[in-house]
């Protein structure tokens, strides 16, 4: 009910009016408009789209819409010197070369500036050597190779299949193993769902399709040359040798037709078990090198990409709040794409566009939100979340004092099965309440709520009758807001059935085949899932900006803190003797969590009972809610990851996409039995328990009565 009494200007404009204004037909039209040509970061086409969006947001009625530019490090293939991989014989002759481009989809043959598949930020190089197949190139895959199979990757070119973890982690692992180059490929086991045809006849990846993507390990730094500071005209830039997160070995992606040619000749050790075998008709031997007849043949990479400082443009739109203009609710998603961006990002950008249009319509009728809403079209997300991070670095002092919430709006769909939400625990109740009010778009759930279909299809593993909400990881533009600045954040999209579809991401992710037609023909012909996502994202923004009392429930944080403390304690208890030897105790952490739980409960009672008509008291309580997420930030950051500062959540050190809880303790405990100096290793565990305890206790105290 909170939003219906949102402002005293036009109370008739409640959330229903906002939601009713959202139209599937408009989202469809916007998506078509945004996907006719490539919008690669740093290109003229993407600058023109930024100006178009600026113009349209102004027309829609926002108070102001500005372009903010930064000069950041980007990476492009050399137009005259293409990247490829070859098999060479003993005379050095190339007997096989991988393809130089993806065959363009029908109707797009004459489109210019389709960037060929490449691994952004790969250094130049022409390494040559034997191949080692490393499965997904995860930490555990290299453990298996090095520890169990005694296979040494030093001096070898490794070939890894895409999937399971962020590609940058794969490259980092390969570097640490001593590899001289990395070939990434899409295996049909991960990118070809059974019973579905290849594009253009279905949504599966054809053999010539390739996933582009950056291979950085930025750990939240933003522009590699200006970590911590905006890449503006007076910025000091590091030299390339000191740049953050750049890979040190050449990397290149290929499709499964080309991968077949490389993998079919592999010799050496057999794959350790079925989890290492994909769906190609090859033996999946690990190597090193080719089998008998082909043992004198080598693999050679030819990588000539260049990294260059390039101008990027964000679009920032403002809808000024009527009551608390100095409190910001942000809705942001990126605009840059690898090629056409049919799903990533334009299915999200089209939804943001329609949300802006709906808010603008209400504003033209005299309504204003209680708090200021900022809308952002980020640039260069695909190159390392650069646009959002640079803007947040430039505005960090404002954001840390005024930022209420950030809602992310990348791809609206990665499937059409059910809703997927990742958010701070503070937003759980907001999401539950909102989805109970929205209609499900799912077949078989006509007239039922979104909450009901979501709960049925994606049940919580812990709480029966409730849907699953996941931890925030990274790999998208919320990263700087949540992990660095401690602003409550959330994201929502429609997803696949993870039970039956085991492939990673959607098959055509980051390929030339991610087109408007892919969405319109195969994923969402009626754009009903897009509309639902618009309602969820827009509804969250509306409530966050308009509720008299912020729709955050601190008791939900208390519940997960206990769960995470139990989990990390159980991991540590796999080493009972060391815990005794080195006096490792989690008592202090459990005590802090207990204090947090009690204080959160009392705070919630006060929140329920206080006089909402007292503006000072209202602002005070809302500030305690707004600053709670901020209280989990450690200014010193996590070990070796200074821009990941949230003590409760961080991107996993082994997979940027995944979130890890109590990451400082988790990383200190990870593989601790292989640490040479146990006293030092367990000392670090104790230090991290201490940091976590202090942080939880300090956060609890921000919820105590102020005096």
């Amino acid at each position: 009910k909170s939003s219906s009494e949102a402002t005293n200007i036009t109370p008739k404009h409640n959330m229903k009016a906002f939601l009713d204004e959202l139209k599937a037909e408009n989202i469809k039209k916007f998506l078509h408009n945004f996907t006719q040509i490539p919008h690669l970061a740093g290109t003229e086409q993407n600058f023109q789209l930024a100006k178009q969006i600026q113009s349209q947001w102004k027309e829609f009625g926002l108070d102001s819409v500005e372009l903010t530019h930064y000069d950041v490090l980007l990476s492009y293939p050399n137009k005259t010197h293409p990247n490829y991989i070859s098999i060479i014989n003993e005379d050095g002759n190339e007997i096989f070369n991988t393809s130089l481009f993806e065959p363009p989809p029908a109707g797009y043959e004459n489109v210019s500036d389709i960037v060929p598949p490449f691994s952004a930020f790969s250094p130049q190089g022409m390494p040559e050597g034997d191949l080692v197949y490393v499965n997904y190139a995860r930490t555990e895959d290299f453990f298996k190779l090095e520890r169990d199979m005694k296979i040494n990757c030093s001096g070898k070119i490794v070939i890894a299949r895409y999937g399971k973890v962020f590609r940058g982690n794969k490259v980092k692992n390969a570097q640490l193993a001593g590899a001289t180059g990395v070939i990434l490929y899409s295996d049909p086991a991960d990118y070809f769902a059974p019973g579905v045809k290849s594009y253009p006849d279905g949504w599966n990846l054809p053999g010539g399709g390739v996933q582009r993507g950056n291979i950085l390990n930025l750990n939240g730094a933003g522009d590699p040359l200006t970590p911590g500071y905006p890449a503006n005209e007076y910025a000091y830039r590091r030299g390339m040798a000191e740049a953050v997160g750049l890979p040190s070995i050449p990397v290149h992606p290929i499709g499964y037709y080309d991968a077949q040619k490389l993998l079919e000749k592999m010799g050496g050790s057999a794959s350790p078990d079925s989890s290492w075998r994909g769906s190609l008709k090859v033996p999946y031997n690990v190597g090193p090198g080719f089998t008998g007849n082909f043992s004198t043949q080598k693999v050679k990479m030819h990588i000539h990409s260049t990294s260059e400082v390039t101008r990027i443009y964000n679009v920032i739109g403002t809808l000024r709040g009527a009551v608390e203009p100095d409190r910001y609710v942000i809705l942001g998603g990126h605009r840059d794409s690898w090629v056409f961006g049919g799903i990533d990002p334009q299915s999200g950008a089209a939804v943001v566009h329609e949300i802006v249009r709906s808010f603008g319509t209400l504003k033209k009728e005299g309504w204003r939100p209680r708090r200021t809403i900022l809308f952002a079209s980020w640039d260069a997300e695909e190159f390392g979340l650069l646009g959002s991070t640079e803007w947040a670095e430039e505005n960090s002092r404002l954001l840390q004092e005024r930022g209420v919430a950030y809602i992310n709006a990348d791809s609206s769909i990665e499937g059409n099965y059910t809703l997927r939400v990742d958010c701070t625990p503070l937003m759980y109740s907001l999401v539950y309440n909102l989805t109970k009010e929205l209609e499900s778009p799912d077949e078989g759930f006509e007239g039922k709520s979104l909450y009901e279909s979501w709960t049925k299809k994606s049940p919580s593993p812990e709480f029966s009758g409730m849907p699953r909400i996941s931890k925030l990881g990274s790999g998208n533009d919320f990263e700087v807001f949540f992990q660095r600045l401690g602003i409550a954040s959330g994201r929502a999209r429609y997803t696949k059935n993870w039970e039956t579809n085991k492939f990673s991401s959607y098959p055509l992710y980051h390929s030339v085949y991610e087109t408007y037609e892919l969405v319109e023909k195969f994923y969402d012909p009626m754009f009903k899932y897009h509309l639902t996502v618009a309602q969820v994202r827009g509804g969250m923004v509306f409530e966050l900006a308009n509720s008299v009392v912020l729709p955050f429930d601190c008791r939900d944080y208390a519940v997960v803190l206990r769960k995470y403390a139990d989990k990390i304690y159980n991991i540590s208890m796999k080493h009972p003797q060391e815990m005794k030897t080195y006096s490792v105790s989690f008592d202090s952490l459990f005590s802090a969590v207990k204090n947090f739980t009690e204080i959160a409960s009392k705070f919630s009672e006060r929140l329920r009972d206080f006089d909402k008509s007292n503006p000072i008291l209202l602002r005070m309580m809302n500030d305690q809610l707004m600053f709670l997420e901020r209280a989990f930030i450690d200014p010193l950051g996590l070990p070796d990851r200074p821009f990941y500062r949230h003590v409760i959540y961080a991107p996993s050190s082994h997979n940027k996409y995944a979130g890890e809880s109590f990451p400082g303790i988790y990383d200190a405990l990870f593989d601790i039995e292989s640490k040479v100096d146990p006293s030092q290793a367990w000392g670090e565990v104790k230090r991290q328990i201490s940091v976590a305890t202090f942080t939880v206790q300090a956060a609890a105290e921000t919820l105590s009565e102020v005096a």
């Epitope: 520890r147 169990d148 796999k574 080493h575 003797q577 060391e578 100096d677 146990p678």
Partner: antibody, heavy 116, light 107 residues
Framework: EVKLEESGGGLVQPGGSMKLSCVAS????????MNWVRQSPEKGLEWVAE??????????HYAESVKGRVIISRDDSKSSVYLQMNNLRAEDTGIYYC???????WGQGTTLTVSS | NIVMTQFPKSMSISVGERVTLTCKAS??????VSWYQQKPEQSPKMLIY???NRFTGVPDRFTGSGSATDFILTISSVQTEDLVDYYC?????????FGGGTKLEMK
């Protein structure tokens, strides 16, 4: 505190057998890879064998000089690691140390003498 | 097998002197090199691991450096109790191998 205590050494004739034992304490034994390393005036320090933990399927590795003649094993319930040595030779003489992974902790050693 | 060669085999020094012990690997072993100290009638004790990390409890007069094939153990100011045997070892690949040792003696 980490403690490793070897036993089972002694005098044995060439061609004979001997089983060395090592009992560990002060750490969660089942998580750790264990080694045997020997020392003699002639050959200095020489790694003999390694046995890994259950999570690594108790994988074993041996030095070329002992392959086929020795078996490393472990009993996690007893926090113990063993070295069964068969077909012993004079050059197997030395002090045998039980060590933890990376050779970061060593026992006091047990002496094996192979002589007729 | 990777051969670890230590030199000198022995050296005579005075208390308070700075001493440098050298270890050379026959092929690249990254930084997977440890240094051990062995006192008479005792088992070896780890001093340095990962080429340059001091093991817990080791006095800071002991410093390790190097990578790939060349490694150094430096004792900044030798104490009487340091006049014992020192070994380097590699754990980069099987079989793990050790150097022949360097004996420090009183001048």
């Amino acid at each position: 505190e980490v403690k490793l205590e070897e036993s089972g050494g002694g005098l044995v004739q060439p061609g004979g057998s001997m089983k060395l034992s090592c009992v560990a304490s002060g750490f969660t034994f089942s998580n750790y890879w264990m080694n045997w390393v020997r020392q003699s005036p002639e050959k200095g320090l020489e790694w003999v064998a390694e046995i890994r933990s259950q999570s690594n399927n108790f994988a074993t590795h041996y030095a070329e000089s002992v392959k086929g003649r020795v078996i490393i094993s472990r009993d996690d319930s007893k926090s113990s690691v063993y070295l069964q040595m068969n077909n012993l030779r004079a050059e197997d003489t030395g002090i045998y140390y039980c060590t933890r992974r990376w050779n970061n902790f060593w026992g006091q050693g047990t002496t094996l003498t192979v002589s007729s | 097998n990777i051969v670890m060669t230590q030199f000198p085999k022995s050296m005579s020094i005075s208390v308070g002197e700075r001493v440098t012990l050298t270890c050379k690997a026959s092929e690249n072993v990254g930084t997977y090199v440890s240094w051990y100290q062995q006192k008479p009638e005792q088992s070896p004790k780890m001093l340095i691991y990962g080429a340059s990390n001091r093991f817990t409890g080791v006095p800071d007069r002991f410093t390790g450096s190097g990578s790939a094939t060349d490694f150094i153990l430096t004792i900044s100011s030798v104490q009487t109790e340091d006049l014992v045997d020192y070994y380097c070892g590699q754990s980069y690949t099987f079989p793990y191998t050790f150097g022949g040792g360097t004996k420090l003696e009183m001048k």
